[in-house]
Amino acid sequence: IWELKKDVYVVELDWYPDAPGEMVVLTCDTPEEDGITWTLDQSSEVLGSGKTLTIQVKEFGDAGQYTCHKGGEVLSHSLLLLHKKEDGIWSTDILKDQKEPKNKTFLRCEAKNYSGRFTCWWLTTISTDLTFSVKSSRGSSDPQGVTCGAATLSAERVRGDNKEYEYSVECQEDSACPAAEESLPIEVMVDAVHKLKYENYTSSFFIRDIIKPDPPKNLQLKPLKNSRQVEVSWEYPDTWSTPHSYFSLTFCVQVQGKSKREKKDRVFTDKTSATVICRKNASISVRAQDRYYSSSWSEWASVPCS
Amino acid sequence: RNLPVATPDPGMFPCLHHSQNLLRAVSNMLQKARQTLEFYPCTSEEIDHEDITKDKTSTVEACLPLELTKNESCLNSRETSFITNGSCLASRKTSFMMALCLSSIYEDLKMYQVEFKTMNAKLLMDPKRQIFLDQNMLAVIDELMQALNFNSETVPQKSSLEEPDFYKTKIKLCILLHAFRIRAVTIDRVMSYLNAS
């Protein structure tokens, strides 16, 4: 058993049918010595008396808010949560496996640049009685500071019969140098509590591996005289790291017909302009990627050919 | 239709072209190592990230773009002295800092070159003959060093008398390639920045 926060405790249980559970001793936070009784949650049934209460915690029915009283007055509370270990592996009931980029990906994180700021998000089908708390650091043995905000509900989607909820959090490394070569990964730890169930999820990454630039901005077309060709131009996104000559991007320019089945023409360039043939009803899209370290491509920025 | 990227004119800054080749070569070598050594811990998540140049060179600090020198988090610089004549210095106005930067890059390359050559000698003794260093990568390191053209003491190739542990050598190769790829990215950024300046 360990303390999650003041008066909230997590009991770790080896979870299998007929498991013996864990013996837990609760102590009433009071100078009083006698006349103390204990109850669980809203029930008025007295579970025991005395300054300490010994309970065998086996299932969720044994978890909850234990309260010690004296003469009708509440003295203190202890909330017991359960953390299930199923065959040597901690349970992952609360969050959905996003399966991207690989199986068992519960937390996904992205950064728009090398400033040390990043966003993480996760999915759940649970709508109520749910709380998250996020901590982060650079490295784990001698951790350096990363400050995270509060997790917020950022999107709701309907997936088949189920509603899916997306939560996200923004974090910022306290003293980040955009040009630094990372040798210690960023660690992100999310504590999730649903009713009386506690779970924790972690992710470990280098900022360089989670970079996803914003799409190029100011995408414009300039028709070339006496030709079906157009000059496409764009600019680096505002959120990208500067100077751009150091933090360079490479671009992919795509000409896509109205129908998804039509052949796509693609050109790769390090410049912020390209000459392409603009077909009727087609659209021109441009996306960006770090020129030297192949992390994710940005989303597409698009303009119609007409 | 995937069109290759046109190589920029290297005339103004000859090192840019070489540094791009270096990044390509080390990335290819790392990919090959990860595929060939699939039963070894060779992914970024599995290895320890060690920097063999740590406390010996200070490339990141010495090559910091001017715009980032205002960022206090970037100024954890270390005092290191370097030789300051090099053929990549296209203009006489080149600052002492730029000379320091390029000589730091040169020292990095020299250190990695020695490590890779020592390692290759060990890998050639492996009866499994599982993996060797790409000669192209070694050649590209050499070309960039020549383009930088710094006079510096030659570091003798390390030789070891004990029987090599091939498992450890292959893991060390992965560690080295990951670190060198990161340094090659920094070198490319620096060359691109200097080229634009």
């Epitope: 979870w15 299998y16 049918p17 007929d18 498991a19 065959d87 592996i89 009931d93 | -």
Partner: antibody, heavy 115, light 112 residues
Amino acid sequence: QVQLVQSGGGVVQPGRSLRLSCAASGFTFSSYGMHWVRQAPGKGLEWVAFIRYDGSNKYYADSVKGRFTISRDNSKNTLYLQMKSLRAEDTAVYYCKTHGSHDNWGQGTMVTVSS
Amino acid sequence: SYVLTQPPSVSGTPGQRVTISCSGGRSNIGSNTVKWYQQLPGTAPKLLIYVNDQRPSGVPDRFSGSKSGTSASLAITGVQAEDEADYYCQSYDRGTHPALLFGTGTKVTVLG
């Protein structure tokens, strides 16, 4: 006393369907994940499928994906395996089993797929 | 396809020490716990070892398990006639959990 009692096995023709049941008693069935494991005659153990305690997630072996469906009725304390498009290679003893460091197995039920 | 490899058979005379190996990889045994089962003819498997080296109550102490890196082993010190059975190791793969990964199985024969 934890008990898992299996039923529903038998002889079936290729291409036909069969449903296996596993009745649980002696524990809070709705709190635990459950597996199906099979063993072809003279062969080793092969995992077939898993279902979470609340039925929210199901996982299948590639060899049965799209043909077999694992389900549970927590109000009846029963686990099911619906097998469709049966093949000769599905012939095996099928076991249900609890998920956890200490597990309990059903007695097994024989499924024979033969024309 | 079995990812955990066991020897097809091992044998010993009563009182001898018999060991069965179970070889896997970094993503399974290297990252997860190992169990061992005993299966007597015509019966369901019985748990012998859980979490690499733990014995459930009721399992004789002549059975012991260990794990090192990407391999595990089961030892029977002082093998007895009633130990003649098939033995299976089981683990998980970090990418496909909760799918159970079973070893190929080992037939233990007690001679004499």
